[in-house]
């Protein structure tokens, strides 16, 4: 029961985290105009990964996309890449984890297969979260570095336009969304990995033991699994495991990584 709860909670936390990573990536407020020196402006600037915007005191908002690829700073490109990789891995992880959920029955899938999928999705969530945290941190570092520069415009030359701007930029809401979302995805991934270890406890408490008879082999595994002889192909007992179809004999003859605690 605890394993199911851990797995379910891990899935939900990761889902929220990945939704947050997607939201952060799409948000325009990665950097916002620093208002320290001049707190009252009729025009407020903010910038995202894909476009920069102004919000006027009248409520009018105008955005301008970064219509160049080569003209953008390498660091910005790197941040974009990290966030996209994080989203892609997270999305795949979510897809895998749905099928891995203990509360969902799909055909005659073994718990060992679900454990494997849970571990895979957990690792994907961890990497996804790390990508998001890394991306946001790189951008934050870029902002800090640029903050003290005289022009303090981190996109100098963006779009092929030279800018003589005194505007300084500070952390935008998207950075905090990204950090929190990355952290949640990471935590969700860890929970999935923990849940993986607890799946099918009967299988995973002991190493599989094989008893070999002279005439034929009888593989025995504790936990109520029926013994099956080595005679015949035993094709009617094939199960999906570890990405491929194997007989029960094959499964029991080669202990998987889940057979050790």
């Amino acid at each position: 029961m605890a394993v199911t709860a851990c797995q379910g909670l891990g899935f939900v936390v990761s889902l929220i985290g990945i939704a947050g990573i997607i939201a952060a990536t799409c948000m325009d407020q990665w950097s916002t105009q620093d208002l320290y020196n001049n707190p009252v402006t009729a025009v407020f600037n903010y910038q995202g990964l894909w476009r920069s915007c102004v919000r006027e005191s009248s409520g009018f908002t105008e955005c301008r996309g970064y219509f160049t690829l080569l003209g953008l700073p390498a660091m910005l490109q790197a941040v974009r890449a990290l966030m996209i990789v994080g989203i892609v891995l997270g999305a795949i992880g979510l897809l895998v984890s749905i099928f891995a959920l203990k509360c969902i029955r799909i055909g005659s899938m073994e718990d060992s297969a679900k454990a494997n999928m849970t571990l895979t999705s957990g690792i994907m969530f961890i990497v996804s979260g790390l990508c998001a945290i890394a991306g946001v941190s790189v951008f934050a570092n870029m902002l800090v570095t640029n903050f003290w520069m005289s022009t303090a415009n981190m996109y100098t030359g963006m779009g092929g336009m030279v800018q003589t701007v005194q505007t300084r930029y500070t952390f935008g809401a998207a950075l905090f969304v990204g950090w929190v979302a990355g952290g949640l995805t990471l935590i969700g991934g860890v929970m999935m990995c923990i849940a993986c270890r607890g799946l099918a406890p009967e299988e995973t408490n002991y190493k599989a033991v094989s008893y070999h008879a002279s005439g034929h082999s009888v593989a025995y595994k504790p936990g109520g699994f029926k013994a099956s002889t080595g005679f015949g192909s035993n094709t009617k007992n094939k199960k999906i495991y570890d990405g491929g179809a194997r007989t029960e004999d094959e499964v029991q003859s080669y202990p998987s990584k889940h057979d050790y605690v």
């Epitope: 009729a42 025009v43 915007c53 006027e56 005191s57 009248s58 009018f60 003589t164 701007v165 505007t167």
Partner: antibody
Framework: QVQLVQSGAEVKKPGASVKVSCKAS????????ITWVRQAPGQGLEWMGE????????FYNEKFKGRVTMTTDTSTSTAYMELRSLRSDDTAVYYC??????????????WGQGTLVTVSS | DIVMTQSPDSLAVSLGERATINCRSS????????????LTWYQQKPGQPPKLLIY???TRESGVPDRFSGSGSGTDFTLTISSLQAEDVAVYYC?????????FGGGTKVEIK
């Protein structure tokens, strides 16, 4: 066509208050801000503040803060500017102008004809 | 407050000649968010309210003759009347539309020589 029609000239004594009106027509009143600018005789233009009828948000020039109040009546599409504690150096022509709004950037494209306020004892 | 400095104070130009008015702001009026300069030019004739000529430093208001053009970025801006006409005699003001309080230049009086 867009029109901003201001109230007539006023003569006030020092310490008194004046309330200038600006009636807008020819456009959706709530879609644009109203800015107030004054011009002392033979002098340049001085921005006093602006109000956005849709939200009621106001931005005042610190120089006039505490003495000026800008309001709007959306039912009559009229903007008001009240200046209190008048001094002789408040003698000027007061203009209202249509500013930016949620659908358009900020610049003053239409102006009222101006209201001359004379402060004299 | 942002100081807008216009030069010259007055300008006498022959009909059909070019008139150039300069405006300098104490801080950059360039907005990186939309790549626009929040500087506006107005024309004021005696006894009349100001008239919008150019906004965003270089965008001509509809109905304004194409002999009027604006240029510049950041802190330095120019209004050019390519071929002065008699009806262009007026005082021209530049205005900071970026920082509160919004401020106007002192004005440049354009006359016919």
């Amino acid at each position: 066509q867009v029109q901003l029609v201001q109230s007539g000239a006023e003569v006030k004594k020092p310490g008194a208050s004046v309330k200038v009106s600006c009636k807008a027509s020819g456009y959706t009143f709530t879609n644009f801000g109203i800015t107030w600018v004054r011009q002392a005789p033979g002098q340049g233009l001085e921005w006093m503040g602006e109000i956005y009828p849709s939200s009621g948000n106001t931005f005042y020039n610190e120089k006039f803060k505490g003495r000026v109040t800008m309001t709007t009546d959306t039912s009559t599409s009229t903007a008001y500017m009240e200046l209190r504690s008048l001094r002789s150096d408040d003698t000027a022509v007061y203009y209202c102008a249509r500013g930016g709004g949620p659908l358009r950037s900020r610049y003053f494209d239409y102006w009222g004809q101006g209201t001359l306020v004379t402060v004299s004892s | 407050d942002i100081v807008m400095t216009q030069s010259p104070d007055s300008l006498a130009v022959s009909l059909g000649e070019r008139a150039t008015i300069n405006c300098r702001s104490s801080q950059s009026l360039f907005s990186s968010g939309n790549q626009k300069n929040y500087l506006t030019w107005y024309q004021q004739k005696p006894g009349q309210p100001p008239k919008l000529l150019i906004y965003w430093a270089s965008t001509r208001e509809s109905g304004v003759p194409d002999r009027f053009s604006g240029s510049g970025s950041g802190t330095d801006f120019t209004l050019t009347i390519s071929s002065l006409q008699a009806e262009d005699v007026a005082v021209y003001y530049c205005q900071n539309d970026y920082y509160y309080p919004l401020t106007f230049g002192g004005g440049t009086k354009v006359e016919i020589k």
